[in-house]
């Protein structure tokens, strides 16, 4: 009698995620009498996926009509296929008995998995970083198979070269991660730059997935501060402006000092932006000279966004007759900044 | 429709033969075990015989060396040749298909009685 | 041979009834058990192989359990046309064998 005989004629399977696989399965003969079961992978482990004698596999189902006794067609098909299906599938033959005896394997179909990644998520630095600082972004991507991956970082479309990427796990696996660091170098001008995070993978068709974080939400802008003084007024009063530019982001509080003593505190709202993406803003204000023996001291005041305070001082140099007007008043900009401010154009 | 229609059964003295015949519609005798079965007056079910796909033969002990199974493929049909019958043969016997893969029974037919007496 | 014990030979019941019959086999018999019904006059009818698969057009009323020499036949809500003699049956090894019977009856 001729020996039987389990073919299963594909040494491997490639399923995109969410399909049908269907795994193939002949035996060469039906005697002896006893059933046909299907496993994940060998050895003492392995894992029963379908039995045609009995049992509930919902996602399993046979492709020929199991009621044809004649039908030597053993073959499966298994729906909603996840990465957690992946494994080398067995179909071997058992003859009927207490227990069933194990008679024949077949050599094994490998169910290999292909599966999305996710769409790359970017995160940026905790707190903001100014012009010339280097900063951290990652980019992270889940789920995906096989392990065959590419990640491109662009900043306003150039590709991004200080890159180190990782994907897990290194040995095998039902699905991967991917991590990847960029380190970007923080100009004046990248309140309106981006960084996109781009993952291309087999499963995409060659329309990769991008994840993108905005610059704006990493950097901070110092701002220029600018005192000046407008020609005296007939009623004795002087205009004395300050100008704070090109900073970024918008939160910022101005205070006016006179001899050291607040005069007034400003909030900056609604500002208008610059091409740039930053900010401008000028606060005004009139000193009485008449009011004031001596020369006055004006200190603008500038805190942004949480940061230690910048100071630029302006004297207004108040003469002993203060009707004789114009060239009896005298100004003089006596301000310095306490902290570096990086200069730029705009 | 898939059917199995007993003819042969009758009234035979103890030590006499008789051949029961099973025909099979609607589905291919020969890819399946087939059986007999049957049912004394008034008692329980007993197996008596049975025929493999490969053409093996199997019967219970009481019948050994008396009864014999058999088919013909042609015409999808199964037969039982009794000999040396005896008073304890008397039943109803049943056609019974070998079901998918493990052999349970699925399809019977209606039955034919066989009595022995003198 | 593997002898197949049921129990009871007989019951009865009422319309509406869950109703148990069980069956032992003399030696272990996996999960190759099959369950019939029979109507005086008529020929057996299957029921339930592998201890606890359902044939084609047999209600979900009738469910099995049980494997190894233990196994049960339950009905979940007897209706009228259910009152018979259901039989067990193992077919792991040759030659097959029955149970006696349990003969179910209305109260």
């Known amino acids: 009698e001729e020996e039987l005989q389990v073919i299963q004629p594909e040494k491997s399977v490639s399923v995109a995620a969410g399909d049908s696989a269907t795994l193939n399965c002949t035996v060469s003969s039906l005697i002896p009498v006893g059933p046909i079961q299907w496993f994940r992978g060998a050895g003492p482990g392995r894992e029963l996926i379908y039995n045609l004698k009995e049992g509930h596999f919902p996602r399993v189902t046979a492709v020929s009509d199991p009621t044809k006794r004649n039908n030597m067609d053993f073959s499966i098909r298994i729906s909603n296929i996840t990465p957690a299906d992946a494994g080398t599938y067995y179909c071997v033959k058992f003859r009927k008995g207490s227990p069933d005896v194990e008679l024949k394997s077949g050599a094994g179909t490998e169910l290999s998995v292909r599966a999305k990644p996710s769409a790359p998520v970017v995160s940026g630095p905790a707190v903001r970083a100014t012009a010339e600082h280097t900063v951290s972004f990652t980019c992270e991507s889940h789920g995906f198979s096989p392990r065959d991956i590419t990640l491109k970082w662009f900043k306003n479309g150039n590709e991004l070269s200080d890159v180190q990427t990782n994907v897990d796990p290194a040995g095998k696996s039902v699905s991967y991660s991917i991590r990847s660091t960029a380190r970007v170098l923080l100009t004046r001008r990248d309140v309106h730059s981006q960084v996109i995070c781009e993952v291309a993978h087999v499963t995409l068709q060659g329309d990769p997935l991008r994840g993108t974080a905005n610059l704006s939400e990493a950097i901070r802008v110092p701002p220029f501060l600018e005192v000046t003084q407008q020609s005296m007024r007939a009623d004795n009063q002087v205009n004395v402006t300050c100008q704070v530019t090109k900073f970024y982001p918008q939160r910022l509080q101005l205070t006016w000092l006179e001899n050291g003593n607040v005069s007034r505190t400003e909030m900056a709202s609604a500002l208008p932006e610059n091409k740039d993406g930053t900010y401008n803003w000028t606060s005004w204000l009139l000193v009485n000279v008449s009011a004031h023996r001596d020369d006055v001291k004006l200190t603008c005041q500038v805190e942004h966004d949480g940061q230690p305070a910048v100071n630029k001082s302006f004297s207004v140099k108040v003469s002993a007759h203060p009707k004789e007007q114009g060239s009896n008043t005298a100004a003089e900009n006596t301000g310095t900044n306490e902290r570096n401010i990086y200069g730029g154009s705009g | 429709e898939v059917q199995l229609v007993e003819s042969g059964g009758g009234l035979v003295q103890p030590g006499g033969s008789l051949r029961l015949s099973c025909a099979a519609s609607g589905f291919t005798l020969s890819s399946y075990d087939m059986h007999w079965v049957r049912q004394a007056p008034g008692k329980g079910l007993e197996w008596v015989s049975a025929i493999g796909t490969a053409g093996d033969t199997y019967y219970t002990g009481s019948v050994k060396g008396r009864f014999t199974i058999s088919r013909e493929n042609a015409k999808n049909s199964l037969y039982l040749q009794m000999n040396s019958l005896r008073a304890a043969d008397t039943a109803v016997y049943y056609c019974?298909?070998?079901?998918?893969?493990?052999?349970?029974?699925?399809?019977w037919g209606q039955g034919t009685m066989v009595t022995v007496s003198s | 041979d593997i002898q197949m014990t049921q129990s009871p030979s007989s019951l009865s019941a009422s319309v509406g009834d869950r109703v148990t019959i069980t069956c032992r086999a003399s030696q272990d018999i996996n999960n190759y058990l099959a369950w019939f019904q029979q109507k005086p006059g008529k020929a057996p009818k299957s029921l339930i192989y592998?201890?606890?698969s359902l044939h084609s057009g047999v209600p979900s009323k009738f469910s099995g359990s049980g494997s190894g020499t233990d196994f049960t036949l339950t009905i979940s809500s007897l209706q009228p046309e259910d009152f018979a003699t259901y039989y067990c049956?193992?077919?792991?090894?040759?030659?097959?064998?029955f149970g006696q019977g349990t003969k179910l009856e209305i109260k």
């Open positions: 019974v298909r070998g079901g998918v893969w493990d052999d349970a029974f699925d399809i």
């Open positions: 592998t201890a606890s």
């Open positions: 049956q193992q077919y792991v090894s040759y030659p097959y064998t």
